[in-house]
């Protein structure tokens, strides 16, 4: 009689997580009598997956009824596959004995599990940055298999190129994780911008997963300041306006100082949004000119989003007191537009949080 061969026809089988895997095995002879066992791996540490003779294997069912007369089909079906089931499975014939003796093994079938990546999670910088600065966004996705995966970054639909991606682990594993860090240069117009991390994988059937982050969480747009004087009113009161424009986020505190003394402090709230997502705010201060002998130095001090204060000063000339002056005719604008904190020449006057 021919010598027994154990045939495992497929070198590899790929199955989606959650599905069933069929591992085929046939013997070429009824001789010798003895059971079949399935193992994952080889050597002393191999794992018993199914034994025809004994044991409880709730996820494994023989494809062919083991009691079928002259059965030589020892294929099995493993249900509810997870990435942890990946590995090489061996169909092993035993010769009947006390105990049964291992006789011959099939060549093995490698089971790979196709597992979908988790939804990408995009996280931005811990602290806000201003325009022209570069910030990093990180995208992470886990639990996918096989290892091959494609990740792309977009900003407002435009693909980004400045990013670095790692897939771990480097060696063989039941499942993998991807982590990518993209560098994005901010502009003042980015309050409404969005970065998108897109992950494509064989398990997604051409429908990539996306994770998003809003640049509004990462950006700070410092305000422009402008202080102007309105016409002198009949009651010798001058209306001075501080216009704070194009700032984001809304968190802003404005303080008026008269000759260096705090006159009033206000907090911005419930401001209407500009088209670009920034905010504007206007504050007025009435100065009673007749109450002052000398010129009054007014300072609009703005503290935005916990940053160092920005000042804009304005002098109201008490000596010039015609009743019907036009704007700025009775005052001298001594302030500078101090948007750039580094070049602020009034720094020593600023109040820091």
């Amino acid at each position: 009689e021919e010598e027994l061969q154990v045939i495992q026809p497929e070198k590899s089988v790929s199955v989606a997580a959650g599905e069933s895997a069929t591992l085929n095995c046939t013997a070429t002879s009824l001789i010798p009598v003895g059971p079949i066992q399935w193992f994952r791996g080889v050597g002393p540490g191999r794992e018993l997956i199914y034994s025809q003779k004994e044991g409880h294997f709730p996820r494994v069912t023989p494809v062919s009824d083991p009691t079928k007369r002259n059965n030589m089909d020892f294929s099995i079906r493993i249900s509810n596959i997870t990435p942890a089931d990946a590995g090489t499975y061996y169909c092993v014939k035993f010769r009947k004995g006390s105990p049964d003796v291992e006789l011959k093994s099939g060549a093995g079938t490698e089971l790979s599990v196709r597992a979908k990546p988790s939804a990408p999670v995009v996280s931005g910088p811990a602290v806000r940055a201003t325009a022209e600065h570069t910030v990093s966004f990180t995208c992470e996705s886990h639990g996918f298999s096989p290892r091959d995966i494609t990740l792309k970054w977009f900003k407002n639909g435009n693909e980004l190129s400045d990013f670095q991606t790692n897939v771990d682990p480097a060696g063989k594993s039941v499942s993998y994780s991807i982590r990518s860090t993209a560098r994005v240069v901010l502009t003042r117009r980015d309050v409404h911008s969005q970065v998108i991390c897109e992950v494509a994988h064989v398990t997604l059937q051409g429908d990539p997963l996306r994770g998003t982050a809003n640049l509004s969480e990462a950006i700070r747009v410092p305000p422009f300041l402008e202080v102007t004087q309105q016409s002198m009113r009949a009651d010798n009161q001058v209306n001075v306006t501080c216009q704070v424009t194009k700032f984001y986020p809304q968190r802003l505190q404005l303080t008026w100082l008269e000759n260096g003394n705090v006159s009033r402090t206000e907090m911005a709230s419930a401001l209407p949004e500009n088209k670009d997502g920034t905010y504007n705010w206007t504050s007025w201060l009435l100065v009673n000119v007749s109450a002052h002998r000398d010129d009054v130095k007014l300072t609009c001090q703005v503290e935005h989003d916990g940053q160092p204060a920005v000042n804009k000063s304005f002098s109201v000339k008490v000596s010039a007191h015609p009743k019907e002056q036009g704007s700025n005719t009775a005052a001298e604008n001594t302030g500078t537009n101090e948007r750039d904190y580094k070049d602020d020449d009034d720094k020593h006057h600023h109040h820091h949080h």
Epitope: E1, L30, I31, V33, G34, P35, S51, Q52, K53, E54, G55, D65, P66, T67, K68, R69, N70, N71, K96
Partner: antibody
């Protein structure tokens, strides 16, 4: 190791019935056929029937079709053979045997139950 | 049904000699290249023990002095050299269809 346990003796009255048991251990009960064989004192072996414990499929020797009924209890890994309308001709040793190769052979045997039909 | 006829019904063989037992089937018990004949040994007060399966294959733990041969309808069990412990009754069984046993051959050791 494979074991098939059978009670040693059964004494029954003519016309009565007896239910013989065969408790299996050391293997997956539902994966192998159980055969029943009769041997009268000083005589040869007679195959009675076989049962597949997984689904209770049975095959009978036509001679014993009206005499023997095979059943299994999967929860206790036990095979049963009920013999009805007993006569002195049913006095014999009854063996259960397990078919390990699905070849309709008898690889492992119980020690047998001696049934005596006597008034 | 396939009828198996064993011969002789009994035989006595000297220690160390060859014992040959024949089993003839009323029709072929071969199928798909296999010969569905099995041989059993039974000693008094014990259940039968499988010796040979599919005509020529020694079961686990059976001494090599036992051998089986034959095909189609004619099969033979050989024991050589016979030992004292081989005194027993030997049965052939087929499984080409539902099983049946031969009538048995009683072997005595001289």
């Amino acid at each position: 190791q494979v074991q098939l346990q059978q009670p040693g003796t059964e004494l029954v009255r003519p016309g009565a019935s007896v239910k013989l048991s065969c408790k299996a251990s050391g293997y997956t009960f539902t994966n192998y056929w159980i055969n029943w064989v009769k041997q009268r004192p000083g005589q040869g072996l007679e195959w009675i029937a076989m049962i597949d414990p997984s689904d209770s499929e049975t095959h009978y020797n036509q001679i014993f079709k009206d005499k023997a009924t095979l059943t299994v209890d999967k929860s206790s890994n036990t095979a049963y053979m009920q013999l009805s309308s007993l006569t002195s001709g049913d006095s014999a040793v009854y063996y259960c045997a397990m078919d390990y190769g699905s070849l309709y052979a008898m690889d492992y045997w119980g020690r047998g139950t001696s049934v005596t039909v006597s008034s | 049904d396939i009828v198996l006829t064993q011969s002789p019904a009994s035989l006595a063989v000297s220690l160390g000699q060859r014992a040959t037992i024949s089993c003839r089937a009323s029709k072929s018990v071969s199928s798909s290249g296999y010969n569905y004949i099995f041989w059993y040994q039974q000693k008094p007060g014990q259940p039968p023990k499988l010796l040979i399966y599919l005509a020529s294959n020694l079961d686990s733990g059976v001494p090599a002095r036992f051998s089986g041969s034959g095909s189609g309808t004619d099969f033979t069990l050989n024991i050589h050299p016979v030992e004292e412990e081989d005194a027993a009754t030997y049965y052939c069984q087929h499984s080409r269809e539902l099983p049946t046993f031969g009538g048995g051959t009683k072997l005595e050791i001289k």
